[in-house]
Amino acid sequence: YSNFRKSVDSTGRRQYQVQNGPCSYTFLLPETDSCRSSSSPYMSNAVQRDAPLDYDDSVQRLQVLENILENNTQWLMKLENYIQDNMKKEMVEIQQNVVQNQTAVMIEIGTSLLNQTAAQTRKLTDVEAQVLNQTTRLELQLLQHSISTNKLEKQILDQTSEINKLQNKNSFLEQKVLDMEGKHSEQLQSMKEQKDELQVLVSKQSSVIDELEKKLVTATVNNSLLQKQQHDLMETVNSLLTMMSSPNSKSSVAIRKEEQTTFRDCAEIFKSGLTTSGIYTLTFPNSTEEIKAYCDMDVGGGGWTVIQHREDGSVDFQRTWKEYKEGFGSPLGEYWLGNEFVSQLTGQHRYVLKIQLKDWEGNEAHSLYDHFYLAGEESNYRIHLTGLTGTAGKISSISQPGSDFSTKDSDNDKCICKCSQMLSGGWWFDACGPSNLNGQYYPQKQNTNKFNGIKWYYWKGSGYSLKATTMMIRPADF
């Protein structure tokens, strides 16, 4: 006698029990509940969604699915083995021993088993497909991550290498800079010390020069005074001898004039008995203001007050109106005496002007004007000249009638240009005129075809820059 019973065990799993005589067969089937429902992230028999963003979570879920698949596979294998080993025998016995309805029950069980197996297989296939899908996706992601990681690693390595190189370079340069700073500071210190020493030396030399100049002037004055005194003594001795030799002559008392201590020009100095060329102190007319000038006591009878001299280019003659007014340079070398003094001096008495010139070939020439004066500053120190004689040209190289004086900062010429800026130096420019003795100094072999040189057209022509010039004045009645 056989019967078939379906029940649920304590764990909630379904079991099938077959009673066949003394033997009882119980079949425990795995439940489909262990598979996730369609509400889960992995739907049964559904299209696979994109992999979640969390990589660790995906790996965990994959492991769970792998475990489930392994369990199901093992169970199926056991079931298959069981059916093969046991059911064959039982089915033979059942076929031999049971009636028609038992066969039906067995067929129903078998069908049910087969259906469940098929369903389980389908589900396993689905899970397998999902697992494969997920695995493939994960593999792809891992591959992409790996590639990105490799790239990043390579970039990081390259950058690290570059940074190291730069750091090395930087260290090298820093070291160099430090070395240079050290050397520089040493050099600076050395230069500062040298500068200080030089400044001390210069100041010492300046004071020595000043002292020497003073002594020179004093010596010159003393020398001239001694010469005058000697001259006077000789005259006195001679007159005394004369008086003594003529017994009828009456004794006379020599009344000496008070010694003159201030001079307005070099002619007065010469007449006072000081006949040595050199630097003397002159006093402005009707004033106590003094000025140092060079007195030429040798040329043409002496007594010349030098108002301009060029000889070597040591002094810059591109000066301002104020500088030309007050004078600049050194009376021992190149200098300009000063327009204001010359204007005041020549405005009181009639003066002659002599201009001495030297070229680079060893030639000398001069121009002599028998009347020269400068107007006042209100008339821009306009020059007035008459009566030209001399060897430096039959025509006056200073434009006639006289022009106003112009400097780089005071344009009073008759040119559409600014002559002082174009030709350099302060001068009585016309437009711009045949002369400029205050032009740029050029050395030998560089002194021709010059637009701004020391020019005296009616002696050396255009563009010839002279070697030396001297302008000097003396009273017409000297």
Partner: nanobody
Framework: EVQLVESGGGLVQPGGSLRLSCAAS????????IGWFRQAPGKEREGVSA????????YYADSVKGRFTISSDNSKNTVYLQMNSLRPEDTAVYYC??????????????????????WGQGTLVTVSS
């Protein structure tokens, strides 16, 4: 250094033609006026013609008007004097000279000879049959 070099002189028959060139270096013609001067034996140097390239102005002495033509090629920094219908009295050493274009008296058009500070060595022109 400013240099002016004349060329083109020579012997020519009366009525003939010559073209003189003045090549300048050390200056640009835009900023200067170039003049042609001549000096016959025993005579003063005299102005013949001049050109101011910047304004295209030209000057001619009365004795050469209609016969001489002055021109310039600034790209070559050269000034030319085309001399046609030459006469025996045109025989002289011809010089070219330069003056800064701005060195001009108010109201005047041309420059006195003493304003020309750069000179060439000259080229001899002989007009003879």
């Amino acid at each position: 250094e400013v240099q002016l070099v004349e060329s083109g002189g020579g012997l020519v028959q009366p009525g003939g033609s010559l073209r003189l060139s003045c090549a300048a270096s050390g200056i640009t013609l835009d900023d200067y006026a170039i003049g042609w001067f001549r000096q016959a034996p025993g005579k003063e140097r005299e102005g013949v013609s001049a050109i101011r390239s910047s304004g295209g102005s030209t000057y001619y002495a009365d004795s050469v008007k209609g016969r001489f033509t002055i021109s310039s090629d600034n790209s070559k920094n050269t000034v030319y004097l085309q001399m046609n219908s030459l006469r025996p009295e045109d025989t002289a050493v011809y010089y070219c000279a330069a003056v800064p274009a701005g060195r001009l008296r108010y109201g005047e058009q041309w420059y006195p000879i003493y304003e020309y500070d750069a000179w060439g060595q000259g080229t001899l022109v002989t007009v003879s049959s």
